[in-house]
Amino acid sequence: KESCDVQLYIKRQSEHSILAGDPFELECPVKYCANRPHVTWCKLNGTTCVKLEDRQTSWKEEKNISFFILHFEPVLPNDNGSYRCSANFQSNLIESHSTTLYVTDVKSASERPSKDEMASRPWLLY
């Protein structure tokens, strides 16, 4: 018999390698039975997890599971770190495993020229 507890499907020790400047969606897959729980994202700072206020989030519904998405538009270098989603369900707080974003700052890593620089130096394209 399937449990009717809320379950958050973020893998333990999961990691994502992403590029600064790119858009990225961090998904928190949520399984629930009746009423969709209230879900939030937080970012770990040492042992405390700081709730992310004023960040763009959205829900994506699929047949057997829903996804609470934290949007990075675009990814910034200081988005590097570990994140956790939490659900409030029947007065209980259910916390996911943390997932870690490793942000590569492309500009500093490879000194890749910007689009504007590329436009002013068309010979780079050949």
Epitope: Q7, Y9, I10, K11, R12, Q13, S14, E15, H16, S17, T47, H97, S98
Partner: antibody, heavy 119, light 112 residues
Framework: EVQLVQSGAEVKKPGESLKISCKTS????????IHWVRQMPGKGLEWIGR????????KYSPSFQGQVTISADKSISTAYLQLSSLKASDTAMYYC????????????WGQGTLVTVSS | DIVMTQSPDSLAVSLGERATINCKSS???????????LNWLQQKPGQSPKRLIY???KLDSGVPDRFSGSGSGTDFTLTISSLQAEDLAVYYC?????????FGQGTKLEIK
């Protein structure tokens, strides 16, 4: 029925490369981590590394970093271990294992692939 | 790397008797989520390993209840309450709390 079916035994010459496969069924590979483990003849188990088939992220043991490449193709529920520049000391049984990534609810092992490196 | 040390290296026990295998880690296996990721594996002769126990004490489905796991922090124990002939195997502890994951050297369990 849950299965992890590994490719068959291989005999290789020193310096050659090899890619071992691990075909999974009976569960969603995206919900798991695929681990690779080496067992040299008559010895214990050594963790090589693991792959997250959902996003391709891979972790290696420092002892094997640079010597092996771990990957997966989630569309065909198959994981791979590539061994490069083989040496006689790479002769061993290689196992894949699939562990559920969320709550550790299952941990299945393949039957192993025996690799023999000999000139 | 975390060193996992099993004792004894080999063990001979009579059928129906109790078998105890110890596993000591060089640092705590308690993860920041409050769980301890310590597995016990059984490898019978000529076979691949099989997970018996996870999270220190949780039995995999289909594993006989004569097997049990206990411990915390750095010290762990696998107990077989009444040894059966089919328990002849090498037993390994395996930590997957800290990278790189590491195994104990194995304990060979024989029938006396």
């Amino acid at each position: 029925e849950v299965q992890l079916v590994q490719s068959g035994a291989e005999v290789k010459k020193p310096g050659e490369s090899l890619k071992i496969s691990c075909k999974t069924s009976g569960f969603n590979i995206k919900d798991t981590y695929i681990h690779w483990v080496r067992q040299m003849p008559g010895k214990g188990l050594e963790w090589i590394g693991r792959n997250d088939p959902a996003n391709g992220n891979t972790k290696y043991s420092p002892s094997f970093q640079g010597q092996v490449t771990i990957s997966a193709d989630k569309s065909i529920s198959t994981a791979y271990l590539q061994l490069s520049s083989l040496k006689a000391s790479d002769t061993a049984m290689y196992y894949c294992a699939s562990y559920e990534g969320y709550y550790e609810r299952f941990g299945y092992w393949g039957q192993g692939t025996l690799v023999t490196v000999s000139s | 790397d975390i060193v996992m040390t099993q004792s004894p290296d080999s063990l001979a026990v009579s059928l129906g008797e109790r078998a105890t295998i110890n596993c000591k880690s060089s640092q705590s296996l308690l993860d920041r989520d409050g769980k301890t990721y310590l597995n016990w594996l059984q490898q019978k002769p000529g076979q691949s390993p099989k997970r018996l126990i996870y999270l220190v004490s949780k039995l995999d489905s289909g594993v006989p209840d004569r097997f049990s796991g206990s411990g915390s922090g750095t010290d762990f124990t696998l107990t077989i309450s009444s040894l059966q002939a089919e328990d002849l195997a090498v037993y390994y502890c395996w930590q997957d709390t800290h990278f790189p994951y590491t195994f104990g050297q194995g304990t060979k369990l024989e029938i006396k």
